[in-house]
Interface confidence: low
C-alpha cells in the first residue's frame, strides 16, 4: 500500500537498520526511499523538547510485516518509503536550507558570490555531495561568501546544526544539471587500480555500472567476469574512487571490465532498472519466499510484487511435476545485491522491476520499429504530439514531443498569431489525423512559455513548453522520451530520426499518416557553409542528405528528431527552419535540445 | 480564408529597380513573420528575404544583400520588396510566404500565385 503522507508527532518503534542525517522529513523519506532495504522512518525536528544532538535524525527501518508499532512522541515524523508506491521517482533535491549547516568533509572552499554559485559548484565538482554557504551576513569576516564542498561515505551529512546566517544544499547531479562528463564506455580487458570503497556481487558489467552510479561514493568501477581466473573473485564489482575523480592506473587484465559512474548521465539511460535475466545463473541472499511460478518472466512479477523482494531466482519444473510450474525464490541482502552468484545449476535470475520507478520513464524500451517505408505504425513514436489550433477552424499546427506527465516541448514560432492557449489542443497517441473526430480526447494548454530571447526561428532560442491542464498516463502508444544529457554533448548520433504530419514537399498538404525519415545529422561548419546567410550557432543542429530528397518540412515544426543511442531514444532536435523542403545541399536546422537542458528543467521544475 | 496577392513585377533592364507588394488578408498580419521566396526557371525556391513580426528584424540571401530592402505595414497588411540594381539572376517568379519555418499557418491553398519578375536588356 503506498502511504505518502508523513505522520506529525509519531515514532515508528523497532526495525532500524541505520541512522543519518538529513535536513527536513521529506528528503529523508527519499533517503528511505533509495536505501535498499528501508521501508519506513522516523525523522526528528528541531524542538525545544529534543535534545539538539538528536536534531535531524532520519532513522531508517525495515519491517517484515512493512509496518512497526506507533508512539506518540512530539518533534518525530514518521512515514513510509515510497518503493510501495507506483509513481515516478526522484532524487533532485533543489532545496535551500536557511541557517543549516550540514557537516561533512570540507575538502574544497572558495568564494562565491551566491549560494546558487556555490551550488552550482558543487553540482559540476565529482565529488561534491552537499555544501554549506556562509552568506555576507556571516559574523565571521573571513569566511563571508565562502563555499564548502562536502562529501561523505554515505553521501548525506555525518551531523546537522543549527548555524546563523549559513545556508546548505545539494549536489543537483541528480537533477541532470550538471556538466561533468558522461562517459558509457565499458573498457574491456582493463582494471582500474584505485581504491575500492566497496565491493558487491554482480551478474555483468552493466548491472555493476548502474551499482556505482546511485553508490555515493562511486567514480568508477572494475568488474570481475564469470571467466575471471581467480574464482574467488568471479562476478566481484568493485567500486571505487580517486582524488583526481578519474583512474590513476590503468591495468590491461583480460577477463575484467571497466567503467565509470554514469551519474551525468542517469536522466537518459536507466540506472537503477536491471532488467535482464541471466541463464543457468543462481543469485544467493536471504530467502523472503518460495512460490510456484510458471516462468522466470511470472518470477520476475512476484518479485516485483513483493516490496521486501530484491532480486530472485527461479528454478524451472522438472517434466510434467507440478503443473508446469517452477519454484521462484524471492530473496533479499542488505546491500540489494546478491551475496554470491553461481553459474551451471540451470536457475534462471534476474532483480526486481520495482526500482524502474526510480528511473526516468523515458528510458523504457518501446517496441521495434519497422525499417524501411515512409509511414510510421502505431506505438512506434509514442512522444510524438499533433498541437492543432482551433481558431478560425480546427486543423493540425504543429508537432512536439512528451517530455513529463505534463510538459510538451515544441517550436516557438509555432505561436505566431495564436492568443491564448485556450485555442490549443494536443493530441497524443496519434497516428492517423483522420482518427480526429469532435469526441475525440485531448490535452488542454494550461500555459504556453515561449523562451524569452526568441525572435525569430533562424536566430535560434526557437524552443517552447506547453503545461497540460491534465497529466498523461503513461501508455505503450504516449510516453516520453528522454532530454539527452549535458555531459553527452560530445557523442556523434547515427540514428537519427525526424517525423511529422507535414508536407511532402513545400507545396502540399498535411499527411493523414505520421510520417518518418532516417536523416544524418550535419556538423554545425557544415551547415554553415550551406547558410552563408546565416549564423548556424551552437544551440542549433542541422540534419540532411547531401542530395536532399529526405527532410521535415510545413507542418513538422515543433516536432522531434529522435536519436537512438544505447538503446534509448533521445530528443536531440526540435523541427524549426530551413532554406525549402529536401533542397540539396539545404539541411533541415532544427534547435540543439542539449543547450536548453537547463531552462527546460528550470521551467518544468519550478515550484 | 487566408489570402495573399503579389504585385508590382515585370519586365525591367539590368541595374534598374522594382517594387514588390503583398496584399494579405485573412489572417492578423502584424503577427506573422513573412518573407520573399523565388523561384528561378528550372531551379528550387530560394529564401530572399524576411522580416520578424515582433521586432522587424530583417535577414537577406547572400545574394541579394545589400540591394533589396524588405519592409511591411501592418496597418495596410502589406509586405514590400524594394529591389534595386537588379541583375539578370534575379529572375524568377517572386511569392510572398511565411518565414522559413515549418509550422502551418497557410494550407496549400494560401499561397499567393506569384508575381514575375524579368531582369533582360
Known amino acids: 500500500e503506498c502511504v505518502t503522507q508523513l505522520l506529525k508527532d509519531t515514532c515508528f518503534e523497532g526495525g532500524d537498520i541505520t541512522t543519518v542525517f538529513t535536513p527536513s522529513a521529506k528528503y529523508c523519506q527519499v533517503v528511505c526511499t533509495y536505501h535498499p532495504r528501508c521501508l519506513l522512518f522516523t525523522f526528528t525536528a528541531e524542538s525545544p523538547s529534543e535534545d539538539p544532538t538528536r536534531w535531524f535524525t532520519c532513522v531508517l527501518k525495515d519491517s517484515v510485516t512493512e509496518t512497526l508499532p506507533r508512539v506518540n512522541r512530539t518533534a518525530a515524523i514518521s512515514g513510509y518509503s515510497f518503493k510501495q508506491c507506483s509513481h515516478q521517482i526522484s532524487a533532485c533535491n533543489k532545496d535551500i536550507y536557511v541557517d543549516l549547516d550540514m557537516k561533512g568533509i570540507n575538502y574544497n572552499s572558495s568564494v562565491a558570490k551566491s549560494a546558487q554559485e556555490c551550488q552550482e559548484r558543487c553540482t559540476d565538482d565529482v565529488h561534491c555531495h552537499f555544501f554549506t554557504y556562509a552568506t555576507r551576513q556571516f559574523p565571521s569576516l573571513e569566511h563571508r561568501n565562502i563555499c564548502l564542498l562536502k562529501h561523505t561515505q554515505t553521501g548525506t551529512p555525518t551531523r546537522i546544526t543549527k548555524l546563523d546566517k549559513v545556508v546548505s544544499g545539494f549536489s543537483l547531479k541528480s537533477c541532470a544539471l550538471s556538466n561533468l562528463a558522461c562517459i558509457r564506455d565499458i573498457f574491456p580487458n582493463t582494471v582500474f587500480a584505485d581504491s575500492n570503497i566497496d565491493s558487491v556481487m554482480a551478474p555483468d558489467a552493466f548491472v555493476c555500472g548502474r551499482i556505482c552510479t546511485h553508490h555515493p561514493g562511486c567514480l568508477f568501477f572494475t568488474f570481475f567476469s564469470q571467466e575471471w581466473p581467480k574464482e574467488s573473485q568471479r562476478n566481484l564489482c568493485l567500486l571505487k574512487t580517486s582524488e583526481s575523480g578519474l583512474p590513476s592506473t590503468r591495468i590491461k587484465k583480460s577477463k575484467a571490465l571497466s567503467g565509470f559512474s554514469l551519474q551525468s548521465c542517469r536522466h537518459s539511460i536507466p540506472v537503477f532498472c536491471h532488467s535482464s535475466f541471466y541463464h543457468d545463473t543462481d543469485f544467493l541472499g536471504e530467502e523472503l519466499d518460495i512460490v510456484a511460478a510458471k516462468s522466470h518472466e511470472a518470477c520476475q512479477k512476484l518479485c516485483t510484487n513483493a516490496v521486501r523482494c530484491q532480486f530472485f531466482t527461479y528454478t524451472p519444473a522438472q517434466a510434467s511435476c507440478n503443473e508446469g510450474k517452477g519454484k521462484c525464490y524471492l530473496k533479499l541482502s542488505s546491500n540489494g545485491s546478491p551475496t554470491k552468484i553461481l553459474h551451471g545449476r540451470g536457475g534462471i535470475s534476474g532483480y526486481t522491476l520495482r526500482l524502474c520507478k526510480m528511473d526516468n520513464e523515458c528510458t523504457t524500451k518501446i517496441k521495434p520499429r519497422i525499417v524501411g517505408g515512409t509511414a510510421s505504425v502505431r506505438g512506434e513514436w509514442p512522444w510524438q504530439v499533433t498541437l492543432h489550433t482551433t481558431s478560425p477552424t480546427q486543423r493540425h499546427l504543429c508537432g512536439g514531443s512528451i517530455i513529463g506527465n505534463q510538459w510538451i516541448l515544441t517550436a516557438a514560432h509555432c505561436f505566431y498569431g495564436v492568443e491564448s492557449p485556450k485555442i490549443l489542443r494536443v493530441y497524443s497517441g496519434i497516428l492517423n489525423q483522420s482518427e480526429i473526430k469532435e469526441d475525440t480526447s485531448f490535452f488542454g494548454v494550461q500555459e504556453i512559455i515561449i523562451h524569452d530571447q526568441y525572435k525569430m526561428a533562424e536566430s535560434g532560442y526557437d524552443i517552447a513548453l506547453l503545461k497540460l491542464e491534465t497529466t498523461v498516463n503513461y501508455t505503450d502508444s504516449q510516453r516520453p522520451i528522454c532530454l539527452p544529457s549535458k555531459g553527452d554533448r560530445n557523442v556523434i548520433y547515427t540514428d537519427c530520426w525526424v517525423t511529422g504530419w507535414g508536407y511532402r514537399k513545400l507545396r502540399d498538404k498535411i499527411q493523414n499518416t505520421l510520417q518518418k525519415a532516417k536523416i544524418p545529422l550535419v556538423t554545425n561548419e557544415e551547415c554553415q557553409k550551406r547558410y552563408r546567410g546565416h549564423k548556424i550557432t551552437h544551440k542549433m543542429i542541422c540534419a540532411g542528405y547531401r542530395e536532399g530528397g529526405k527532410d521535415a518540412c510545413k507542418g513538422d515544426s515543433g516536432g522531434p528528431l529522435s536519436c537512438k543511442h544505447n538503446e534509448v531514444w533521445h530528443l536531440v532536435g526540435i523541427t524549426s527552419w530551413g532554406e525549402g523542403c529536401a533542397q540539396r545541399e539545404r539541411p533541415g536546422v532544427y534547435t540543439n535540445v542539449v543547450e536548453y537542458v537547463d531552462w527546460i528543467l528550470e521551467k518544468t521544475q519550478a515550484v | 480564408q487566408v489570402q495573399l496577392q503579389e504585385s508590382g513585377g515585370g519586365l525591367v533592364q539590368p541595374g534598374g529597380s522594382l517594387r514588390l507588394s503583398c496584399a494579405a488578408s485573412?489572417?492578423?498580419?502584424?503577427?506573422?513573420?513573412m518573407s520573399w521566396v523565388r523561384q528561378a526557371p528550372g531551379k528550387g525556391l530560394e529564401g530572399v528575404s524576411g522580416?520578424?513580426?515582433?521586432?522587424?528584424?530583417?535577414y537577406y540571401a547572400d545574394s541579394v544583400k545589400g540591394r533589396f530592402t524588405i519592409s511591411r505595414d501592418n496597418a495596410k497588411n502589406t509586405l514590400y520588396l524594394q529591389m534595386n540594381s537588379l541583375k539578370t539572376e534575379d529572375t524568377a517568379v517572386y511569392y510572398c510566404?511565411?518565414?522559413?519555418?515549418?509550422?502551418?499557418?497557410?494550407?496549400?491553398?494560401?499561397w499567393g500565385q506569384g508575381t514575375q519578375v524579368t531582369v533582360s536588356s
Open positions: 485573412g489572417l492578423t498580419f502584424s503577427l506573422y513573420d
Open positions: 522580416i520578424n513580426s515582433g521586432d522587424g528584424s530583417t
Open positions: 510566404a511565411t518565414g522559413r519555418t515549418r509550422e502551418t499557418y497557410f494550407r496549400e491553398d494560401d
